[in-house]
Interface confidence: low
Amino acid sequence: SGTTNTVAAYNLTWKSTNFKTILEWEPKPVNQVYTVQISTKSGDWKSKCFYTTDTECDLTDEIVKDVKQTYLARVFSYPAGNVESTGSAGEPLYENSPEFTPYLETNLGQPTIQSFEQVGTKVNVTVEDERTLVRRNNTFLSLRDVFGKDLIYTLYYWKDSSTGRKTNTTHTNEFLIDVDKGENYCFSVQAVIPSRTVNRKSTDSPVECMGQEKGEFRE
């Protein structure tokens, strides 16, 4: 049938951060090419990444249409140079991915401290509201827009001269904390979705310390 050198894809894996979503699989093709299809549980299959020799396919454009849906993808294997050829059952070989629900499973990207401002013994720390690839009315929504109150940020802060760190949380993108006058503090933030069972937390942001350029100081 001309498919003897065609093997089914395996290790299909979703890689998704802030809704940027890529399906990866193995093996690297030798005598074959791949096409990916994606659908919701109740929807039609849509083909992407036609006859590619890549072992990944960016499915972001599809999943951002409704990040609360559950998606299934499948990877078809075709003989290189003979993509009309099918397997022994009359269809090309394919393998299904695990199910993927972006809203519940996309990884939270590493947040960034946008700025901090000290006024007397208080410091206001602002977390950058990162833009996602989810769109509404032709504009890209921020992480806060998409997750609403499901998303919180945890602030870790400590005196420059000390190892003991304190924590604070916010349901917005700003923290207002009390500090000791004359002391320099360092800050790191983490995005958290407490209601999740998996991928609840992002990695910590880069550490920012007072006395560096992101800070403003007022008496």
Epitope: V64, D66, V67, K68, V134, R135, R136, N137, L141, R144, D145, V146, F147, G148, K149, H171, T172, P194, S195
Partner: antibody, heavy 125, light 108 residues
Amino acid sequence: QVQLQESGPGLVKPSQTLSLTCTVSGGSISSGQYWSWIRQHPGKGLEWIGEIYYSGSTRYNPSLKSRVTISVDTSKNQFSLKLSSVTAADTAVYYCARDTPYYYDGGYYYYMDVWGKGTTVTVSS
Amino acid sequence: EIVLTQSPGTLSLSPGERATLSCRASQSVSSSYLAWYQQKPGQAPRLLIYGASSRATGIPDRFSGSGSGTDFTLTISRLEPEDFAVYYCQQVGVVPYTFGGGTKVEIK
């Protein structure tokens, strides 16, 4: 449809604790909404006191935070407000409301779509 | 705290006229979090508009909302007798959630 009903004493003495309960009928308190308390001083505007999610997580108005506790009892489909150390300035109509996250086209909208009728609380000795 | 300033404080109009109510925020508010309410004496507020421009269920189409960032507007295209009331804007995006001071629409 969902209805809310506030209940509690209409008269509270200064320095005591004001306690109100909001009973949710026609729907489950655990259905994914937030539940708020708002008050309105006589002849004045509206002031948000705080809110609770059915899981128990709360947010409070910082101006009242040191005196406010909001709790939820999912088994009774109720949530409650306690405001300690009351003064005459706490005399108001107290409303409970449902703060609905409405998911549409990739993101959330929030609004208070269901309100109780309100209960008048007077702080006086 | 986000301060919402409503203007005018009072609007005196006749039935059939157009009412334009303004709500200005002290800092930018995502339209997802901006709502308008109507309140009549002795009653609880009633949701009119959410998401700055979407009408709530059962609200007549003479009510419309617009705006973004710091400037929002509620428009009543033709006032009906039942529309004379106090109108509040509200933001539910940043704690503490805040209401404007209200605009009273009264019969001229």
